[in-house]
Amino acid sequence: PGPPAGSPRVSSDPRADLDSAVLLTRSLLADTRQLAAQMRDKFPADGDHSLDSLPTLAMSAGTLGSLQLPGVLTRLRVDLMSYLRHVQWLRRAGGPSLKTLEPELGALQARLERLLRRLQLLMSRLALPQAAPDQPVIPLGPPASAWGSIRAAHAILGGLHLTLDWAVRGLLLLKTRL
């Protein structure tokens, strides 16, 4: 009759688990793209925005060929945890302007948390170490100004978009190697 309702599906096929992770990543990518577009429309960005506390992009066209599943999943999880911290920070510290995007930011945070749980599950199924590599957590201080928090929001959503875009490509490529 199958597992009771609400219990996680036990899968012996890591590719099915990877498929599920790809699906969630794609869904989050679409949400991020939509929210980034909303941000640009509501608060037009002048040029590119960066934030020192954001993780550097882990993948590029040059590194796709040498990807290994343990490294990709571990790095992706660490980077997404950083983005989760940044989204939480935006919601709490971003100022009244960003409160107008509160339903969307809240939904984005929930999806991000869901994807992180899925990656954790996938790593445990593949018997990969759960411990994130040691890296200093930069405390996220108050925005210097409202304009600064809007610029930070553009940087966070832009960086998350790029990270998820490469994550989908990387995970799909790794699936073919399983």
């Epitope: 709490r92 510290a93 409202a146 600064g148 809007i150």
Partner: antibody, heavy 117, light 111 residues
């Protein structure tokens, strides 16, 4: 140094209007959200309204919604509060305040508005 | 009636430590940062603590803020006569879409 100077207060009859101004200097005005906060004589602080750094987002306290309008002119480094249909309970010292996020890091000295017949 | 609840008064003698509480709900203190302001008699309020527990430059480290769940508190150690003032907590409220304040606590330094 950062300076916020309110003006436009005075005595006004119930039902009439008044416009408060807040002249800002010593910082890049167009980078900051700005608020109005008021304090009735002998009472506590009450938030009135906020306007985003470029003027597109505005929020108001329920007690002033539909009667007060917050606006700004970034070219003049000035914040405004247009107060219509004034009531006796609007009598207070009105402060403008600068905010980087949700905390008021600089306040003006305040301007007194008295609504009385 | 204020959305955030503070005791109307508090007192202490010089050198003592006093704590002022601020109670709210999940839509304000529970999900947003808490700030504290000091208002000396006849003057505009001044930022004392922001981001739950950060002090602006120039504020002595005798003042500290903390938060747990839907409550926050301001602690003042080594009380001085010049600390006699009104203290207000505040936070953004997601349900009201605005800033909410506590009713204020009048701190008296005895003796």
């Amino acid at each position: 140094q950062v300076q916020l100077v309110e003006s436009g207060g005075g005595v006004v009859q119930p039902g009439r209007s008044l416009r408060l101004s807040c002249a800002a200097s010593g910082f890049t005005f167009s980078h900051y959200d700005m608020h109005w906060v008021r304090q009735a004589p002998g009472k506590g602080l009450e938030w009135v309204a906020v306007i985003s750094y470029e003027g597109s987002v505005k929020f108001y306290a329920d007690s002033v919604k539909g009667r007060f309008t917050i606006s700004r002119d970034n070219s003049k480094n000035t914040l405004y509060l247009q107060m219509n249909s004034l009531r006796a309970e609007d009598t207070a010292v009105y402060y403008c305040a600068r905010t980087p996020g949700f905390h008021f890091d600089y306040w003006g000295q305040g301007t007194l508005v008295t609504v009385s017949s | 009636q204020s959305v955030l609840t503070q005791p109307p008064s508090a007192s202490g003698t010089p050198g003592q430590r006093v704590t002022i509480s601020c109670s709210g709900s999940s839509s304000n203190i529970g999900s947003n940062y808490v700030n504290w302001y000091q208002q000396l008699p006849g003057t505009a309020p001044k930022l004392l603590i922001y981001y739950d527990d950060l002090r602006p430059s120039g504020v002595p480290d005798r003042f500290s803020g903390s938060k747990s769940g839907t409550s926050a508190s301001l602690a003042i150690s080594g009380l001085r006569s010049e600390d006699e003032a009104d203290y207000y907590c505040s936070a953004w409220d997601d349900s009201l879409s605005g800033v909410v304040f506590g009713g204020g606590t009048k701190l008296t330094v005895l003796g």
